[in-house]
């Protein structure tokens, strides 16, 4: 049991894409406010989003310090206007989140095809290396920097005149594929982390087709 008219947060959920990480919970507060704490398994608790009436808290700055760590968060509930008040056990009411390991669980954002270039019967397709909020030496790392060879891309490509999707794979951000001369092709890419058990695939990139402005053609 907690303080009068204060309810514990519930449905604590991590929402994370390319390491941008937000903790969400319910309920919308009525006469109460929340404070969030986050910690690694072996670390100290750090408070964030003090006495907020929001039902989400951006924890990106904390988890990007080490994306391979496992984090736990907790949400404290306080009566509005009386944040010093505690529950019957002498401390505020709180609820724990599920554990969260960013490297293993962050969703892969929708990739983007940066460019494609045809030279004869070969096409080079390049995937944009998206920047993340993970830092090293004061610079933001790209998705490839963070995941290395764990991250692969699947290219789906097809003749504009047909529906069957051929596939190619790369653990860089470039594909070199064979195409039939004189045919226009369309492309879509998907990011994949095969070593994962959850959140293995991204959504597909927007489709790009030859004959549009992203492409170049050389004999």
């Amino acid at each position: 049991s907690g303080t009068t008219n204060t309810v514990a947060a519930y449905n604590l959920t991590w929402k994370s894409t390319n390491f941008k990480t937000i903790l969400e919970w319910e309920p919308k507060p009525v006469n109460q406010v929340y404070t969030v704490q986050i910690s690694t398994k072996s670390g100290d608790w750090k408070s964030k989003c003090f006495y907020t009436t929001d039902t989400e808290c951006d924890l990106t700055d904390e988890i990007v310090k080490d994306v391979k760590q496992t984090y736990l968060a907790r949400v404290f509930s306080y009566p509005a206007g009386n944040v010093e008040s505690t529950g019957s056990a002498g401390e505020p009411l709180y609820e724990n989140s599920p554990e969260f390991t960013p490297y293993l669980e962050t969703n892969l954002g929708q990739p983007t095809i940066q460019s494609f270039e045809q030279v004869g019967t070969k096409v080079n397709v390049t995937v944009e290396d998206e920047r993340t909020l993970v830092r090293r030496n004061n610079t933001f790392l790209s998705l490839r920097d963070v995941f290395g060879k764990d991250l692969i891309y699947t290219l789906y490509y097809w003749k504009s005149s047909s529906s069957g999707k051929k596939t190619a794979k790369t653990n860089t951000n470039e594909f070199l594929i064979d195409v039939d001369k004189g045919e226009n092709y369309c492309f879509s890419v998907q990011a994949v982390i095969p070593s994962r058990t959850v959140n293995r695939k991204s959504t597909d990139s927007p489709v790009e087709c030859m004959g549009q402005e992203k492409g170049e053609f050389r004999e």
């Epitope: 692969i152 789906y156 051929k166 190619a168 095969p194 293995r200 695939k201 597909d204």
Partner: antibody, heavy 121, light 107 residues
Framework: EVQLVESGGGLVQPGGSLRLSCAAS????????IHWVRQAPGKGLEWVGY????????YYADSVKGRFTISADTSKNTAYLQMNSLRAEDTAVYYC??????????????WGQGTLVTVSS | DIQMTQSPSSLSASVGDRVTITCRAS??????VAWYQQKPGKAPKLLIY???FLYSGVPSRFSGSRSGTDFTLTISSLQPEDFATYYC?????????FGQGTKVEIK
């Protein structure tokens, strides 16, 4: 435990249709790729086609293109092979298989038990 | 399409023998080759992936290697349960293609 179970095989007349199912358990099909492979009596393995259940993308062997359609229902965790305009040469045991990657190299780690399709008048 | 030419189509061997099966790809497939074992009336089972990696639970007497576009499956000491048909397969491009199979029989 990961399992694939095919069903729907049987005897069908030339020109007829049949729908095979591949029910998956122990994993989510949307996170993988599903292939269909067939084996005529006494013959080797022949690839039929694949689907990426997360986006519905498919590709087919030339021998079945225009006649066979692969689909998937992620809510049922099941892939399907719709076979139309069946011919005697489509007689085979049909397998579904789960594809995964080791870095960029694909492999098919789980296969169904197979279901026999016989096309005969 | 990439052709996978597998040889021999069949072989007879005794328990304890060293057995080698080869597959030649018609063009470069990098390491995107897998080997499968199939017994009569059963589904194929994965043995080797990425040309040389032993799949989980497969006995260590099985091994795979690559030299350019030539791929080899070796059984170092044939056991009674190894009498079966073996297939190579490339996944480098769509469509994936299988070798014709090698039937390993008891001498």
């Amino acid at each position: 435990e990961v399992q694939l179970v095919e069903s729907g095989g049987g005897l069908v007349q030339p020109g007829g249709s049949l729908r095979l199912s591949c029910a998956a358990s122990g994993f989510t099909i949307g996170s993988y790729w599903i292939h269909w492979v067939r084996q005529a009596p006494g013959k080797g393995l022949e690839w039929v086609g694949y689907i990426d259940p997360s986006n519905g993308y498919t590709y087919y062997a030339d021998s079945v293109k225009g006649r066979f359609t692969i689909s998937a229902d992620t809510s049922k965790n099941t892939a399907y092979l719709q076979m139309n305009s069946l011919r005697a040469e489509d007689t085979a045991v049909y397998y579904c298989a789960r594809a995964d990657y080791y870095y960029v190299d694909e492999y098919w780690d789980y296969w169904g038990q197979g279901t026999l399709v016989t096309v005969s008048s | 399409d990439i052709q996978m030419t597998q040889s021999p189509s069949s072989l007879s061997a005794s328990v304890g023998d060293r057995v080698t099966i080869t597959c030649r790809a018609s063009q470069d497939v990098n390491t995107a080759v897998a080997w499968y074992q199939q017994k009569p009336g059963k589904a194929p089972k994965l043995l080797i992936y990425s040309a040389s990696f032993l799949y989980s639970g497969v006995p260590s007497r099985f091994s795979g290697s690559r030299s350019g576009t030539d791929f080899t499956l070796t059984i170092s000491s044939l056991q009674p349960e190894d009498f079966a048909t073996y297939y190579c397969q490339q996944h480098y491009t769509t469509p994936p293609t299988f070798g014709q199979g090698t039937k390993v029989e008891i001498k």
